[in-house]
Interface confidence: low
């Protein structure tokens, strides 16, 4: 499958529009601070070069790898050292070290201004004036803020973004039509980015084997009627796709993802009965649909797992002959029978099974040793079940905002060294598990909740990795991918933490809070709550609730006052004094 010119091959496979969009995403994900116009210039240069290679694959430089071509282009940016500091040193390296160097400098939390949404009329005018530039800007702004966003999926988001503007800018009430669609895209986009970030972390921090295990479990749940060999083939192909995207090889990734979707649809009879509708859609929608497709029904009369994996006299023989294949079969068989389990739970069970076989297959009587292995699974299954039950009860009792606050307090006490914005962001997202998953019946709660929590805790891990401040976070994040959530759940109050000095400035509020959206106002209050806990980590729930209730009343009162600023200044001082007294600060 060797091509004389890789760049010509990808240009022909993907078409000019997708080629340009993917190169823009790639460059924006690497050079996150560069202005839009600079990126467009680089993309146009690469595209013109690609066209010369399509015309003549033997032309000068057309035989170079995509990493070499793109890296060379990125290294022409004159302001590289001024803007990116030591990232400029990457340019002195040869491939593949240069690309690895660029990857290491991707920033999960770039210092970029918040995206402010202009007025609807302004957006519609910009869309009509220059549709192409408008959509490119969308790709650029998302890609630079989410340097691991799944590139072919971002093309799908851009297509929906374009459709929303095409439809709504002609509507009688543009805002009523457009704003809910943009909100939905924003929320789905954040979720998609976080899910992909976990896949990349899994590959980069824990290796291909960890990712493949995750994929075996998830695809076996989704396609329980497919044979193990079929699932294995899909896992291999999916691993290649995600390895490419996480490695910045976006053209190859998008091309291979399209090939995988094509293969799945051509072989849907041996994969799943749920794929029919997906496979009738155009490419981007098709790939998205397959990725989100519901689990197929489990085959009837599946035999007991014990026969092959506990009772058989060949267990150790089969394990010794091909360890990963045998463990893969175990995971496949267990997962296809348990759509009610989270993927991480299935991986914990497989790890327990592997550990038991490692120990027992070297023992005098292996069968006697591993005969009770399935009994070891019981506590592993019950732990997330109980946790989800308790937290869903708490969520139903408190509602989302107060449930988030309970988690804010819980996590601030566990890891008070973590920055306040990170604690607020992560705890708010953890709290969303309630409205996302607690509405589901028992059989769907665990896969929804625990796999979502894995995604959110990965956000904490990648943000913390940038500026590590807590050994406990580092430990939970690096020891085991599948045990991250149990590790964080098991953390108690950090007794070694020295409370933060009280700073009245942190609790000084102004009239601008009155004009904020409900969400932004919540974030302000939750920021204050985290700071309170950092000052007084031993404060009781009741004490914190009293202070927060007073705070809510204070904001409400001053926002209704004629002279808001004076009210905030005077009443604020009283509130701080009262809070200090209540908490013994």
């Amino acid at each position: 499958d060797a091509h004389k010119s890789e760049v010509a091959h990808r240009f022909k496979d993907l078409g000019e529009e997708n080629f340009k969009a993917l190169v823009l995403i790639a460059f924006a994900q690497y050079l996150q601070q560069c202005p839009f116009e600079d990126h467009v210039k680089l993309v146009n240069e690469v595209t013109e070069f690609a066209k010369t290679c399509v015309a003549d694959e033997s032309a000068e430089n057309c035989d170079k790898s995509l990493h070499t071509l793109f890296g060379d282009k990125l290294c022409t940016v004159a302001t590289l050292r001024e803007t990116y500091g030591e990232m400029a040193d990457c340019c002195a390296k040869q491939e593949p070290e240069r690309n690895e160097c660029f990857l290491q400098h991707k920033d999960d939390n770039p210092n970029l201004p918040r995206l402010v949404r202009p007025e609807v009329d302004v957006m519609c005018t910009a869309f009509h004036d220059n549709e192409e530039t408008f959509l490119k800007k969308y790709l650029y702004e998302i890609a630079r803020r989410h340097p691991y966003f799944y590139a072919p999926e971002l093309l799908f988001f851009a297509k929906r973004y374009k459709a929303a503007f095409t439809e709504c800018c002609q509507a009688a009430d543009k805002a009523a039509c457009l704003l809910p669609k943009l909100d939905e895209l924003r929320d789905e986009g954040k979720a998609s980015s976080a899910k992909q970030r976990l896949k990349c972390a899994s590959l980069q921090k824990f290796g291909e084997r960890a990712f493949k295990a995750w994929a075996v479990a998830r695809l076996s749940q989704r396609f329980p009627k497919a044979e193990f060999a079929e699932v294995s083939k899909l896992v291999t192909d999916l691993t290649k796709v995600h390895t490419e995207c996480c490695h910045g090889d976006l053209l190859e990734c998008a091309d291979d993802r399209a090939d995988l979707a094509k293969y799945i649809c051509e072989n849907q009879d041996s994969i799943s009965s749920k794929l029919k509708e997906c496979c009738e859609k155009p490419l981007l929608e098709k790939s998205h649909c397959i990725a989100e497709v519901e689990n197929d029904e489990m085959p009837a009369d599946l035999p007991s797992l014990a026969a092959d994996f506990v009772e058989s006299k060949d267990v150790c023989k089969n394990y010794a002959e091909a360890k990963d294949v045998f463990l893969g079969m175990f995971l496949y068989e267990y997962a296809r029978r348990h759509p009610d389990y989270s993927v991480v739970l299935l991986l914990r069970l497989a790890k327990t099974y592997e550990t038991t076989l490692e120990k027992c297959c070297a023992a005098a009587d292996p069968h006697e040793c591993y005969a009770k292995v399935f009994d070891e699974f019981k506590p592993l299954v019950e732990e997330p079940q109980n946790l989800i039950k308790q937290n869903c009860e708490l969520f139903e009792q408190l509602g989302e905002y107060k449930f988030q606050n309970a988690l804010l307090v819980r996590y601030t006490k566990k890891v008070p060294q973590v920055s306040t914005p990170t604690l607020v962001e992560v705890s708010r997202n953890l709290g969303k598990v309630g409205s996302k998953c607690c509405k589901h019946p028992e059989a769907k709660r665990m896969p929804c909740a625990e796999d979502y929590l894995s995604v959110v805790l990965n956000q904490l891990c990648v943000l913390h990795e940038k500026t590590p401040v807590s050994d406990r976070v580092t430990k939970c994040c690096t020891e085991s991918l599948v045990n991250r959530r149990p590790c964080f759940s098991a953390l108690e109050v950090d007794e070694t933490y020295v409370p933060k000095e009280f700073n009245a400035e942190t609790f000084t509020f102004h009239a601008d809070i009155c004009t904020l959206s409900e969400k932004e106002r919540q974030i302000k209050k939750q920021t204050a709550l985290v700071e309170l806990v950092k000052h007084k980590p031993k404060a009781t729930k009741e004490q914190l609730k009293a202070v927060m209730d007073d705070f809510a009343a204070f904001v409400e009162k001053c926002c209704k006052a004629d002279d808001k600023e004076t009210c905030f200044a005077e009443e604020g001082k009283k509130l701080v004094a009262a809070s200090q007294a209540a908490l013994g600060l």
């Epitope: 290294c75 022409t76 004159a78 050292r81 400029a88 040193d89 990457c90 002195a92």
Partner: nanobody
């Protein structure tokens, strides 16, 4: 094999001028941005100036702005640094690098500004 060979250094009086050259080989010179970097005795390397692959875009460290000019000739695979109004603090070994790296990959050329 990537090779960068600098020349044009020497001893010059304060206020004088020098033109440094850097001959490149072993890579597609016209595809890369290039930089000049200097290292004074007993100090770490200091980035001086950079130019993009086409020569259209240039950038300078504050300490040399208005006095130094970076240029390139892609046909000759050569990078230049025109240094005017030289000061004693410009004394250093000057070397060219690919991109804007400050990791030294060549011998460099000595520039000494002294009366």
């Amino acid at each position: 094999q990537v090779q960068l060979v600098e020349s044009g250094g020497g001893l010059v009086q304060p206020g004088g001028s020098l033109r440094l050259s850097c001959a490149a080989s072993g890579f597609t010179f016209g595809s890369f941005g290039m930089s000049w970097v200097r290292q004074a005795p007993g100090k770490g390397p200091e980035w001086v100036s950079a130019i993009d692959s086409s020569g259209a875009d240039t950038i300078y460290a504050e300490s040399v702005k208005g006095r130094f000019t970076i240029a390139r000739d892609n046909a000759k695979k050569t990078l230049y640094l025109q240094m005017n109004s030289l000061k004693p603090e410009d004394t250093a070994v000057y070397y060219c690098t690919i991109g804007q790296s400050i990791s030294r990959g060549s011998q460099g050329t000595q520039v000494t500004v002294s009366s």
